[in-house]
């Protein structure tokens, strides 16, 4: 069974998938469509890297631009380095500026909804 066939079989169960499962899927050539991606749990999407999202979505990654103001894409963008987002070639804006340090302060993030940044 190839990645696309596997994805069709599990598609209906993906809404509650944890980050670990999404990372594993990104290695299997599944080409997840945008509609499915938009239904994923935000907390499961946030830890994914730009490279992992690119592999997870395949050609569907082109659709991220139209969804950049909507969750979970909007919140995911805020967590990525702008340099990494730039590699997607879509003009996605709102990432962490180059040279900034991300502090993983869970309480701070829970209160503000955004990661804590230290400037250069």
């Amino acid at each position: 069974m190839n990645g696309s066939e596997y994805f069709v079989k599990i598609q209906s169960f993906l809404g509650g998938a944890p980050t670990e499962d999404l990372k594993a899927l990104s290695q299997q050539n599944v080409s997840m469509d945008l509609a499915t991606f938009m239904k994923l749990r935000t907390d499961a999407v946030l830890p994914l890297t730009v490279a992992e999202v690119q592999k997870l979505l395949g050609p569907h990654v082109e659709g991220l631009k139209a969804e950049e103001r909507h969750r979970p894409v909007r919140d995911w963008i805020l967590r990525q380095r702008q340099d990494d987002l730039d590699t997607l070639g879509l003009g996605l804006q709102g990432g962490i500026p180059n040279g900034y340090l991300v502090l993983d302060l869970s309480m701070q993030e829970a209160l503000s909804g955004t990661p804590c940044l230290l400037g250069p």
Partner: antibody
Framework: EVQLVQSGAEVKKPGASVKVSCKAS????????MHWVRQAPGQGLEWMGN????????YYNERFRSRVTMTVDKSTSTVYMELSSLRSEDTAVYYC??????????????WGQGTTVTVSS | DIQMTQSPSSLSASVGDRVTITCKAS??????IAWYQQKPGKAPKLLIH???ELQPGVPSRFSGSGSGTDFTFTISSLQPEDIATYYC?????????FGGGTKVEIK
């Protein structure tokens, strides 16, 4: 003003390869993927694939996957489409097209002027 | 891949006539369809996107409607300059597909 300027007409023999260029200007080149569409004489439009100008990653229509190669030169804001093992059925006008990402995956709002490729022995 | 079936493949109408072209998608594409006009030797020109949104500068005699799988493109009053071939494009999928085209001629 957005402009997509393509290379000139080509005449090739069966079995040869052709490389068509598309030079972009008037916008941030790395913010939009570039697509290629072809049109055989008297026929409709056929999507061939696209390329991410930022990292050079292409996605191809399955029909052309074994014969097409899309590349990018960021320094000159130019994308290239190379088609190999040419046959007479590849005689067509080849267009580059830029999408606008207003909704979903984006529709094409700007097109190159087209490059005529003739395959004949 | 999503197939786009466009009809008719050609039509002949008189100046002032109402002209209707349809495109049927092989699966639900929401409203993600665009319509293009192409004249001989020229690149396609975008007329309508998102089913019914007219591009700036495009005359209001052009319109579009539909959703899901069935879409309609209409020229309310055909003009001599509208002689061209018209194509639909679905962009609900990253692997874009076009309809087969409709050649519009004047009687």
């Amino acid at each position: 003003e957005v402009q997509l300027v393509q290379s000139g007409a080509e005449v090739k023999k069966p079995g040869a390869s052709v490389k068509v260029s598309c030079k972009a200007s008037g916008y941030t080149f790395t913010n939009y993927w570039m697509h290629w569409v072809r049109q055989a004489p008297g026929q409709g439009l056929e999507w061939m694939g696209n390329i991410n100008p930022s990292n050079g990653g292409p996605y191809y229509n399955e029909r052309f996957r074994s014969r097409v190669t899309m590349t990018v030169d960021k320094s000159t804001s130019t994308v290239y489409m190379e088609l190999s093992s040419l046959r007479s059925e590849d005689t067509a006008v080849y267009y580059c097209a830029r999408p606008y990402y207003g909704s979903s995956y984006g529709y094409f709002d700007y097109w190159g002027q087209g490059t005529t490729v003739t395959v004949s022995s | 891949d999503i197939q786009m079936t466009q009809s008719p493949s050609s039509l002949s109408a008189s100046v002032g006539d109402r002209v209707t072209i349809t495109c049927k998608a092989s699966q639900d594409i929401n409203k993600y369809i665009a319509w293009y006009q192409q004249k001989p030797g020229k690149a396609p020109k975008l007329l309508i996107h998102y089913t019914s949104e007219l591009q700036p500068g495009v005359p209001s005699r052009f319109s579009g409607s539909g959703s899901g799988t069935d879409f309609t493109f209409t020229i309310s009053s055909l003009q001599p300059e509208d002689i061209a071939t018209y194509y639909c494009l679905q962009y609900a999928n990253p692997l874009r597909t076009f309809g087969g085209g409709t050649k519009v001629e004047i009687k």
